[in-house]
Interface confidence: medium
């Protein structure tokens, strides 16, 4: 088993909003779940976008989870990981709002 | 540390207001976290109830309609529970607690306030 | 909603023994379940997070497991200390919602 590097960026978008984007790399076995949380629970699956679940080349996998929030609510953001029976939850890095 | 201490009346009579306050002592209430209101049924049943965030925004439980609110006073780092018209099965011991963004376990709860609905 | 069903809703064992108390969601809840303890008269005090993370100070005989829709939170080599109600939580969704608790007494 090889754990997962889980990165959250902040990208700038319009009218106020920015998408936040929670990448996962260098992971193996293939299985694994990766979710925006607001609030302590998870987002509806309609609010976040899922990219595939592809290898890098080195014999391990890569995926990403990305969803839109509001400028100056990074703060109620967290990115849940979990794979091969161990977890965590990743915040969205300060000084963006 | 932080310490969250629930206060209010024991007894209300049916079709009144339940009010009850949640002071909390070593931490802004604007800071961070979650700030709710749990109940505990005769029987033990646990019901959610609703926070409000540090932000001051709300999510209520939606078994309980348009009943309850749920606001603050950020001067007394205190936040409070109105729950309306209230009957006998909202008799129960009313917890308020605490969650932090990285998932909503409650990792800190007050002493129970028990609040009797009798005329 | 998610519903939470617990079993047993009661349960009698003796020190030293290993228990284990079940909780069912009625649907997917990917993990994200919390165990309490509460004893008579006192508040609920958290033991397990993220169905797997044991809490602050919680004794390394208590662990969960589970995932999907079944979960479990053992207790090796009861204490007596161990005495009182169990209770899991969801949070994967609003409303959050509890199990109807399991009764552990000692013999």
């Known amino acids: 088993t090889v754990p997962p590097m889980v990165n959250v960026t902040c990208s700038e978008v319009s009218e106020g909003n920015i998408t936040v984007t929670c990448r996962a790399s260098s992971f193996y076995p293939r299985n694994i779940t990766l979710t925006w949380r607001q609030d302590g629970v998870s987002l509806s699956h309609n609010t976040q976008q899922w990219g595939d679940v592809l290898p890098d080349g080195n014999g391990t996998y890569q995926t990403w989870v990305a969803t839109r929030i509001r400028q100056g609510e990074e703060q109620r953001f967290t990115c849940y990981m979990e794979h091969s029976g161990n977890h965590g939850t990743h915040p969205v890095p300060s000084g963006n709002s | 540390d932080v310490q969250l201490q629930g206060s209010g009346p024991g007894l209300v009579k049916p079709s009144q207001s339940l009010s009850l306050t949640c002071s909390v002592t070593?931490?802004?209430?604007?800071?961070?976290y979650y700030w709710n209101w749990i109940r505990q049924f005769p029987g033990n049943k646990l019901e959610w109830m609703?926070?409000?965030?540090?932000?001051?925004?709300?999510n209520y439980n939606p078994s309980l309609k348009n009943r309850i609110s749920i606001t603050r006073d950020t001067s007394k780092n205190q936040f409070f529970l109105k729950l309306s018209s209230v009957t006998t099965e909202d008799t129960a011991t009313y917890y308020c607690a605490r969650y932090d963004g990285r998932g909503a376990w409650f990792a800190y709860w007050a002493q129970g306030t028990l609040v009797t609905v009798s005329a | 909603d998610i519903q939470m069903t617990q079993s047993p809703a009661s349960l009698s064992a003796s020190v030293g023994e290993t228990v284990t108390i079940t909780c069912r969601a009625s649907g997917n809840i990917h993990n994200y379940l919390a165990w309490y303890q509460q004893k008579q008269g006192k508040s609920p005090q958290l033991l397990v997070y993220d169905a797997i993370t044991l809490a602050d100070g919680v004794p390394s005989r208590f662990s969960g497991s589970g995932s999907g829709t079944q979960y479990s939170l053992k207790i090796n080599s009861l204490q007596p200390e161990d005495f009182g109600n169990y209770y899991c939580?969801?949070?994967?969704?609003?409303?959050?919602?509890f199990g109807a608790g399991t009764k552990v007494e000692i013999k």
């Open positions: 939580q969801h949070f994967w969704s609003f409303p959050l919602t």
């Open positions: 609703g926070f409000i965030s540090f932000g001051g925004s709300n």
């Open positions: 070593g931490y802004s209430i604007t800071n961070d």
